[in-house]
């Protein structure tokens, strides 16, 4: 057993059918000795009496909140929440896994740019009695600083029966160099909490390796006199990082016709322009990529032939 | 990625083109690795990020942007000094800090060309002959260095008398290719840089 | 005292189906995963699927997977798998098991696929 | 496709030490913990050893698990006729849980 937070533990239970579970003593916070007795949540079955009690935690109608009281009076509460190891793999009940990049991945980080700002999110089909609590470090020996905000519902789904919620947290390092080399990973905790049970996420990545660039902006045709062709140009996204001589993009331009079968042609370039064929109905999108270090390719920003 | 390779310019800063296929041979080789040595811990997420040029040289430090010494957080800087005389200076007004700059980044590449030879030989004896250097990124190290050509006292291969321990030594490849590409991204940035400004 | 009790099993033509059935006891069934388990005559243990407590997840076996349906009755305490477009190479014991450090297994039910 | 390779049969006489080898990688063995079960013929597989080498109640401590980088064993010290039986060891995948992941099998005789 081990405290959360204040007056509010995880007890730690190895799930199988016919387990012994864990003893847990509770002790009533009180100078008070005598006539101190024991309920759990709204019941008022007394299950023992005096400061302290020892209970037997093996399922969850044994979890939930013990208070102490006396002579009706409320002394102190425990709040017991049950973490659930099942065959030596802690229980990953409440989040959805989204085997993105690969199986078993359910928290999912992004950065627009090397600043040390990056974005998690994660995806649950709960929608009540549930909390979300995050921590970040960089490195877990001799932590450094990351500051996290608190973790919101970004978005809903409908995913054929089932609603599916989304939820989202903004993190920053405390001192972060765009420039520097990384030897650290980031480490991102989140302790969910649904109902009585508890469970813990965890990644870890590199910055390098989660970014992600905004789509180019002011993406802009010019047609060539006496041609099909066309001049795209476009601008580096304001979120990038700067200098742009040092933090450079590369770019990959695409003209893509109205039917999703028909040949897409592609070019990629390392400038801010470049010169293609511009059919009836086609569209030509624009998307980024840090030139050096192969992450992943920004969203395609896109405008019309015509 | 399979982009076109852009030729540079004549006029170009002579260092940027040398420090591309460094990139693109360090990226190959680190491939190549990953996949033949697939049974071994070689990928990002399980080996340690060991920086062997670590309190030799201060590459991201001597050749930061202007634009990023006003952020305190990249400013931790390590005292070093250099030789000064390199011939991707040549045609240029050059300030002492980007001297110091290619002057670490040719540091680097010396220390990592030594570590990379030393293991080379350890692993042609092994039995198994299941990776070398690839003999391409051998040469793009030397062909970068020899156009920063400074001038610098030539450290000596190191040479084990005990039995190479093939499985360490391996792992230790793994190690050092991908600490070698993150500095040979870093260096891309930098003539990138450089070449701009 | 924990027990599964199982049943379905049968000789079944190739491209029929069956459903096994295992009923659990001395638990409450409705707080753990289950799994099904085969073993083909004279060979080893392969794992078949898994099912959350709550019915919610479900894993499959490629070897299976679109053919076959775990499913569970939290109020009957039942596991069932249902096996559609049965192949000669689904012959086989077919186990239910609980998740857990300490499992318990069903008494086994053979089922066999054959013209 | 079974990715635990176990030896098909290993044998000695009563009193002896048998070991029984279970080797994975680093994904499943080298990331999770090892079962080893006991199977005698027509009947359901008996846990033997749980969290690489932990015995559950009523396990004679005869039998013994071990977990090392990326493989696992099982030893019987003192080997008695009755232990003559097909052992399995069960991993998972980091990637692939809960799908179990048994070993080949490994049968053993106790020979005289």
């Known amino acids: 057993i081990w405290e959360l937070k204040k007056d509010v533990y995880v007890v730690e239970l190895d799930w199988y059918p016919d387990a012994p579970g864990e003893m847990v003593v509770l002790t009533c916070d009180t100078p008070e000795e005598d006539g101190i007795t024991w309920t759990l949540d709204q019941s008022s079955e007394v299950l023992g009496s005096g400061k302290t009690l020892t209970i037997q935690v093996k399922e969850f109608g044994d979890a939930g909140q013990y208070t102490c009281h006396k002579g009706g009076e409320v002394l102190s509460h425990s709040l017991l929440l049950l973490h659930k190891k099942e065959d030596g793999i802690w229980s990953t009940d409440i989040l959805k896994d989204q085997k993105e990049p690969k199986n078993k991945t359910f928290l999912r980080c992004e950065a627009k740019n090397y600043s040390g700002r990056f974005t998690c999110w994660w995806l649950t089909t709960i929608s009540t009695d549930l909390t979300f609590s995050v921590k970040s470090s960089r490195g877990s020996s001799d932590p450094q600083g990351v500051t996290c905000g608190a973790a919101t519902l970004s978005a809903e789904r409908v995913r054929g029966d089932n609603k599916e919620y989304e939820y989202s947290v903004e993190c920053q390092e405390d001192s972060a160099c765009p420039a520097a080399e990384e030897s650290l990973p980031i480490e991102v905790m989140v302790d969910a909490v649904h109902k009585l049970k508890y469970e813990n996420y965890t990644s870890s990545f590199f910055i390098r390796d989660i970014i992600k660039p905004d789509p180019p902006k002011n993406l802009q045709l010019k047609p060539l006199k006496n041609s099909r062709q066309v001049e795209v140009s476009w601008e580096y996204p304001d979120t990038w990082s700067t200098p742009h001589s040092y933090f450079s993009l590369t770019f990959c331009v695409q003209v893509q016709g109205k039917s999703k079968r028909e040949k897409k042609d592609r070019v990629f370039t390392d400038k801010t322009s470049a010169t293609v064929i511009c059919r009836k109905n086609a569209s030509i999108s624009v998307r980024a990529q840090d030139r050096y270090y192969s992450s992943s390719w920004s969203e395609w920003a896109s405008v019309p032939c015509s | 990625r399979n982009l076109p390779v852009a030729t540079p310019d004549p006029g170009m800063f002579p260092c940027l083109h040398h420090s591309q296929n460094l990139l693109r041979a360090v990226s190959n080789m680190l491939q190549k690795a990953r996949q033949t040595l697939e049974f071994y811990p070689c990928t990002s997420e399980e080996i340690d990020h060991e920086d062997i040029t670590k309190d030799k040289t201060s590459t991201v430090e001597a050749c930061l942007p202007l634009e990023l010494t006003k952020n305190e957080s990249c400013l931790n800087s390590r005292e070093t000094s250099f030789i000064t005389n390199g011939s991707c200076l040549a045609s240029r007004k050059t300030s002492f800090m980007m001297a110091l700059c290619l002057s670490s980044i040719y540091e680097d590449l010396k220390m990592y060309q030594v570590e990379f030879k030393t293991m080379n030989a350890k692993l042609l004896m092994d039995p198994k002959r299941q990776i070398f250097l690839d003999q391409n990124m051998l040469a793009v190290i030397d062909e970068l260095m020899q156009a920063l050509n400074f001038n610098s006292e030539t450290v000596p291969q190191k040479s084990s008398l005990e039995e190479p321990d093939f499985y360490k030594t391996k792992i230790k490849l793994c190690i050092l290719l991908h600490a070698f590409r993150i500095r040979a991204v870093t260096i891309d940035r930098v003539m990138s840089y450089l070449n701009a400004s | 005292q924990v027990q599964l009790v199982q049943s379905g099993g049968g000789v079944v033509q190739p491209g029929r189906s069956l459903r096994l059935s295992c009923a659990a006891s001395g638990f409450t069934f409705s707080s753990y995963g289950m799994h099904w388990v085969r073993q083909a005559p004279g060979k080893g243990l392969e794992w078949v699927a898994f099912i959350r407590y709550d019915g919610s997840n479900k894993y499959y076996a490629d070897s299976v997977k679109g053919r076959f349906t775990i499913s569970r009755d939290n109020s009957k305490n039942t596991l069932y798998l249902q096996m559609k477009s049965l192949r000669a190479e689904d012959t086989a014991v077919y186990y239910c098991?609980?998740?857990?450090?300490?499992?318990?297994w069903g008494q086994g039910t053979m089922v066999t696929v054959s013209s | 496709s079974y990715v635990l390779t176990q030896p098909p049969s290993v044998s000695g006489t009563p009193g002896q030490r048998v070991t029984i080898s279970c080797s994975g990688g680093r994904s499943n063995i080298g990331s999770n913990t090892v079962k080893w079960y006991q199977q005698l013929p027509g009947t359901a597989p008996k846990l033997l050893i749980y969290g690489n080498d932990q015995r559950p109640s009523g396990v004679p401590d005869r039998f013994s698990g071990s977990k090392s980088g990326t493989s696992a064993s099982l030893a019987i010290t003192g080997v008695q006729a009755e232990d003559e039986a097909d052992y399995y060891c069960?991993?998972?995948?980091?990637?692939?849980?809960?799908?179990?992941?048994f070993g080949t099998g490994t049968k053993v005789t106790v020979l005289g």
């Open positions: 069960q991993s998972y995948d980091r990637y692939t849980h809960p799908a179990l992941l």
């Open positions: 098991k609980t998740h857990g450090s300490h499992d318990n």
